[in-house]
């Protein structure tokens, strides 16, 4: 799997999980989130050569097409596969509110 | 939806469905498929600017992050959303065999 266990230990130009820390205030302009101040969102990036973690039949076909037709612009792209939620704390007036935000953290990637 | 109805009628630099015909023999080197000779596979391509058809909470966050931090390399990518199968005919010896290949045709795209 193209997850932290594999990607963070190997220097990999191909599609892999990349570390990315997002500071809510600085990077998104969201001042209202009290905790956490930021989080490890991660992201997916890298080339998708022939059969590198292809997600669907179509991405496998496209990957092969691209190998045979290297001048073509049609190629699979490295995107998130497994995502996890993030729990945040913010205030409605003086009252704390805890909310779980779905699909905020990328755990693994795929070529799609 | 970033499908044929929208994308094939509009000149769109952003993430959209693009037409792509794949000839099994010429483009993939697959000589064994009898029918069809090829098919409209289509593919997804184009930029994923701020909030252009963002797929998940993470891609929306990444899109916003990229707007505020334009020098960053972390940005969503244009990939397939809805896929459809393709029915093919091939021969096992003299015996015709019909098979449905899943996820072969891209019908719409998203930024993920």
């Amino acid at each position: 799997a193209l997850d932290a266990a594999y990607c963070f230990r190997n220097v990999q130009d191909n599609c892999c999980l990349r570390p990315l820390y997002i500071d809510f205030k600085r990077d998104l302009g969201w001042k209202w989130i009290h905790e956490p101040k930021g989080y490890n969102a991660n992201f997916c990036a890298g080339a998708c050569p022939y059969l590198w973690s292809s997600d669907t039949q179509h991405s496998r076909v496209l990957s092969l097409y691209n190998t045979i037709n290297p001048e073509a612009s049609a190629s699979p792209c490295c995107v998130s596969q497994d995502l996890e939620p993030l729990t945040i704390l913010y205030y409605i007036g003086k009252t704390p509110k805890i909310e779980q935000l779905s699909n905020m953290i990328v755990k693994s990637c795929k070529c799609s | 939806a970033l499908d044929a109805a929208y994308c094939f009628r509009n000149v769109q630099d952003n993430c959209c469905l693009r037409p792509l015909y794949i000839d099994f023999k010429r483009d993939l080197g697959w000589k064994w498929i009898h029918e069809p000779k090829g098919y409209n596979a289509n593919f997804c391509a184009g930029a994923c600017p701020y909030l252009w058809s963002s797929d998940t909470q993470h891609s929306r966050v990444l899109s916003l992050y990229n707007t505020i931090n334009p020098e960053a390399s972390a940005s969503p990518c244009c990939v397939s959303q809805d896929l459809e199968p393709l029915t093919i005919l091939y021969y096992i010896g003299k015996t015709p065999k019909i098979e449905q290949l899943s996820n072969m045709i891209v019908k719409s795209c998203k930024c993920s």
Epitope: G29, W32, Y90, Y91, G93, T95, L101 | Y50, R60, L64
Partner: antibody, heavy 121, light 111 residues
Framework: QVQLVQSGAEVKKPGASVKVSCKAS????????MNWVRQAPGQGLEWMGQ????????NYNEMFEGRVTMTTDTSTSTAYMELRSLRSDDTAVYYC??????????????WGQGTLVTVSS | DIQMTQSPSSLSASVGDRVTITCRAS??????????MHWYQQKPGKAPKLLIY???NLESGVPSRFSGSGSGTDFTLTISSLQPEDFATYYC?????????FGGGTKVEIK
């Protein structure tokens, strides 16, 4: 410059629903809470609730809970407020207003021009 | 809910007068060193306009004749020298508790 442009006036019958839109421009739509405030003719201001466009998080005034739904379309930077089961005392000017951003509940620095909703049989 | 009581509900004044409007909250709106109290101006047929935020901070573009003060439950909006364009209704607003609430308004009329 920041602008909030609301949809036009509506006349509705009691029991019907109304959906008011608010198109934002001139700022990052997903970085600020959008509030909805109403004002009955000759009366004061009443806060209805709010939504954070990037996440879809909402906080509603309990007085409207179950009757109001706030949504956004981030692709067009538009906020919507739908109020159901309308009564004659819902006749008011409805405003969208951007929170200044320090907290979820906050002061509101930019306001739409208002949408008059008249409920009459 | 926090009740916001403004006084007076209306007042008559002349151009150049010093005008003071008060707002009393039913409980303290102070929290983490901030007073969660704001002031707006509204003219007939127009949307409210933010004047003062967090009790004493002047909103950008608002003339310096407007000022705000107070803490806890008692707050004041002062117009040091009333101008013709200041005749309007003024509202206070708290965001210390859900729901966010406004005062009933103070109408400033020409004497």
């Amino acid at each position: 410059q920041v602008q909030l442009v609301q949809s036009g006036a509506e006349v509705k019958k009691p029991g019907a629903s109304v959906k008011v839109s608010c198109k934002a421009s001139g700022y990052t739509f997903t970085s600020y809470w959008m509030n909805w405030v109403r004002q009955a003719p000759g009366q004061g201001l009443e806060w209805m609730g709010q939504i954070f466009p990037a996440l879809g998080s909402t906080n509603y005034n309990e007085m409207f809970e179950g009757r109001v739904t706030m949504t956004t379309d981030t692709s067009t930077s538009t906020a919507y407020m739908e109020l159901r089961s309308l009564r004659s005392d819902d006749t008011a000017v409805y405003y969208c207003a951007r929170g200044i951003g320090n907290y979820a509940l906050d002061a509101m620095d930019y306001w739409g021009q208002g949408t008059l909703v008249t409920v009459s049989s | 809910d926090i009740q916001m009581t403004q006084s007076p509900s209306s007042l008559s004044a002349s151009v150049g007068d010093r005008v003071t409007i008060t707002c009393r909250a039913s409980e303290s709106v102070d929290w983490y060193g901030n007073s969660f109290m704001h002031w707006y101006q509204q003219k007939p047929g127009k949307a409210p306009k933010l004047l003062i935020y967090y009790a004493s901070n002047l909103e950008s573009g608002v003339p310096s004749r407007f000022s705000g003060s107070g803490s806890g439950t008692d707050f004041t909006l002062t117009i040091s020298s009333l101008q013709p364009e200041d005749f309007a209704t003024y509202y206070c607003q708290q965001n210390a508790e859900d729901p966010l609430t406004f005062g009933g308004g103070t109408k400033v009329e020409i004497k």
